[in-house]
Each structure stands twice: as structure tokens, then as C-alpha cells.
Amino acid sequence: PEPPTACREKQYLINSQCCSLCQPGQKLVSDCTEFTETECLPCGESEFLDTWNRETHCHQHKYCDPNLGLRVQQKGTSETDTICTCEEGWHCTSEACESCVLHRSCSPGFGVKQIATGVSDTICEPCPVGFFSNVSSAFEKCHPWTSCETKDLVVQQAGTNKTDVVCGPQDRLRA
């Protein structure tokens, strides 16, 4: 028979033969021949391969370096890499999560729109009219100005995006 020019799924062409790829979690020891199947060996401890492959070396599991603020979110297996995330109060600097930075705080005049997670930073928004934030915080939303009316008080000092209104007693002389 003619030697093949293409092979089935989960096979590869070498020396005019279609050889089976190694399954996830295993690495290639030797290609198939006229006499033998492809030989594969399981990846070692702290190693993985996540696809059908012909790799002669497994990949090392990612190391979640605590010195970079990282911790293990999901332990790796022979078929999957370790997934790192950041310690509380920190978030990843990239999708690969190779290092962490402290969550950003929202300055006075800004409130937290979305609280940070292990993989995303704090999202801040300017306090709209009627709201304020007078602290730098990674958790505090913009607070509504105090409603003087509901307390039978009047506005003595207008609020800003950084300060609450100041309420005071109604002028008794007023009709």
C-alpha cells in the first residue's frame, strides 16, 4: 500500500507512517515503527500536558510565588496546569496571573462601582450630583447626600462630590 500523506485525528505522520499521539497527561518516549506502537509515559509529579501530543517533555506546573502575592486557586494535575490567584486585597496584573498588585482605592469624589476580585482591579466611578465620597477606599460606594427635608432641617451648606450637605435648623422667623 502507498504510504499515507495525512493521518486520522489523534495521529501524526512520521517516517511515512501514521503514529498515535500520546494522550493528555503523557509524553512521547518513542515514535511508532513497523514493529511497535507509539510509546508514551505519564508526566511526573508537578508536570502536565493538556493536549494529545508528541512532546518528549512535560511542562512544569506553574509556581504560585507567595513573594509575588500569589496563592494556589486550583492544584494542577497531569493534564492541567496549576491556576494561581492573588491573596486577599490583591489582584492579578495579567490574564496569566504571574504577579499581583494591591487593589486600587477610589479617591474622595469617587466611589466603588465594582469591588476588585483576585483577577480584576477595583472599578471606580465619579460620584454623580446628589452623591459623595469623602474617603479613599477600595470598598465604599458613593453615598447619597443627607436629605435635610426628611429631618425637618434645611441645607445650610451645599454638598459636593466629596462632602455631604450640612443641615441646620429652619429659620424660625420665616413664615
Partner: antibody, heavy 114, light 112 residues
Framework: QVQLQQSGAELMKPGASAKLSCKAT????????IQWVKQRPGHGLEWIGE????????KYNEKFRGKATFTSDTSSNTVYMQLSSLTTEDSAIYYC???????WGQGTTLTVSS | DVVMTQTPLSLPVSLGDQASISCRSS???????????LHWYLQKPGQSPKLLIY???NRYSGVPDRFSGSGSGTDFTLKISRVEAEDLGVYFC?????????FGGGTKLEIK
């Protein structure tokens, strides 16, 4: 072109050890297993086992485990088979052959005699 | 171990005749990938064995098309359609499906 060159004939005393060599040329040495085969008149061909050079992965016919030991040296592209505690039953022609294609050494004649 | 039984032990033929050698294994040589690792070698006096057929019916590079292999499971046959003088020697079947790999006892093809 692919070639396997085996060491010359050996005459050994019973109880001694012999180390046969098989030098490979013309291909990537660490890419193929090399098998060893024993041939004695009236006993046909017997598969002793095989070695994958470099990583030194080995497979042995249980009948020869303890008798034969395979090693390899990637600096000289040579595979070795050590035969221990020789008896007259070990007198034979020993072939090395690449597992993949049809490449055999010329054979090494081992004679064990007192 | 898988025992490979070859028949006949000796096969006298005239040049130009067809020759047929049988090889039977003590267990199936079909592996989990549906491959059958049964092969045929020819050894001439003073020489190393030469591969003729691999995986039941595949002729090895440079082997004349008068050699053909067939069979499945445990029963296999090597046929030589028109024997030539250079075909004389000892034929061995060989299995590499199960470790340890094993050879048949050999069939001597000789002139009648």
C-alpha cells in the same frame, strides 16, 4: 546510511562476564529502540530485550533478566549488552537490531568454554 | 509467552514453484489499536535476518512482489509465487504484539 557495527567474536570462560557492543551510525541514535536477539543452532531466534538509548528505558524478556543488562553511551552512539555468570548455554550468535526499518548488526559470536 | 508455531519445518521446492509457509500463534496478535504485529524474515547462511513482510501483509522496501503475506488473529501465511534461487534459506515469523517478542522455529526452503 543506517549501520550497526558489532564487536568481534569472544571466547570466554564459564562464570565470567562478557560485554558486547553495537555502534549505531546514520540516524538519530536516541530516536529508536535497539533490540538484542540470540541465535543458537537448534534453538532458533530468541528475543532478549531492547533499550532506548539516552533515557535508558529498557524492556527485558524475563528469561534473560539477571543474565543480560543493557546500557547505552550517547557520546559514542553505542549500545552495550553485558552477559553475566556465563555458561555453555550462553554460547551463541548475538545480534543487535534497530526497531524501525530493517537494520541489523553482523552478529557477535560468543563461545563459552573451559 | 506467545508461542509461534511454523509449518512445515522443511519445504523442498523446484525453482519457479509456489511456496507457502504457515505460522500460528498461541494467542491473538491483534492489539488494542487493532494493529497486528506479525512479520516475516528470511535468513541466509552466515547472514543476519532480512525483513520481508511487516504487519501481516506489508512488503518491506525493496522486497520483490512475489512475496506476499496474509492472515489475521492467530493464523498467518507467507506465499512466494515463483521461487527463485536467491529465495532459499530459513524463513521466520516474528510477533511484536506481546512482550516478550517471539520468533517461530523457522522453515527451511530448499531445492527439491
Amino acid at each position: 546510511q543506517v549501520q550497526l557495527q558489532q564487536s568481534g567474536a569472544e571466547l570466554m570462560k564459564p562464570g565470567a562476564s562478557a560485554k558486547l557492543s553495537c555502534k549505531a551510525t546514520g540516524y538519530t541514535f536516541t530516536g529508536y529502540w535497539i533490540q538484542w536477539v540470540k541465535q543458537r543452532p537448534g534453538h532458533g531466534l530468541e528475543w532478549i530485550g531492547e533499550i532506548l538509548p539516552g533515557g535508558d528505558h529498557t524492556k527485558y524478556n524475563e528469561k534473560f533478566r539477571g543474565k543480560a543488562t543493557f546500557t547505552s553511551d550517547t557520546s559514542s552512539n553505542t549500545v552495550y549488552m553485558q552477559l553475566s555468570s556465563l555458561t555453555t548455554e550462553d554460547s551463541a550468535i548475538y545480534y543487535c537490531a534497530r526497531v524501525g526499518g530493517d537494520y541489523w548488526g553482523q552478529g557477535t559470536t560468543l563461545t563459552v568454554s573451559s | 509467552d506467545v508461542v509461534m508455531t511454523q509449518t512445515p519445518l522443511s519445504l523442498p521446492v523446484s525453482l519457479g514453484d509456489q511456496a507457502s509457509i504457515s505460522c500460528r500463534s498461541s494467542q491473538s496478535l491483534v492489539n488494542s489499536n487493532e494493529n497486528t504485529y506479525l512479520h516475516w524474515y528470511l535468513q541466509k547462511p552466515g547472514q543476519s535476518p532480512k525483513l520481508l513482510i511487516y504487519k501481516v501483509f506489508n512488503r518491506y522496501s525493496g522486497v520483490p512482489d512475489r512475496f506476499s503475506g496474509s492472515g489475521s488473529g492467530t493464523d498467518f501465511t507467507l506465499k512466494i509465487s515463483r521461487v527463485e534461487a536467491e529465495d532459499l534459506g530459513v524463513y521466520f515469523c516474528f510477533q511484536s504484539t506481546h512482550v516478550p517478542w517471539t520468533f517461530g522455529g523457522g522453515t527451511k526452503l530448499e531445492i527439491k
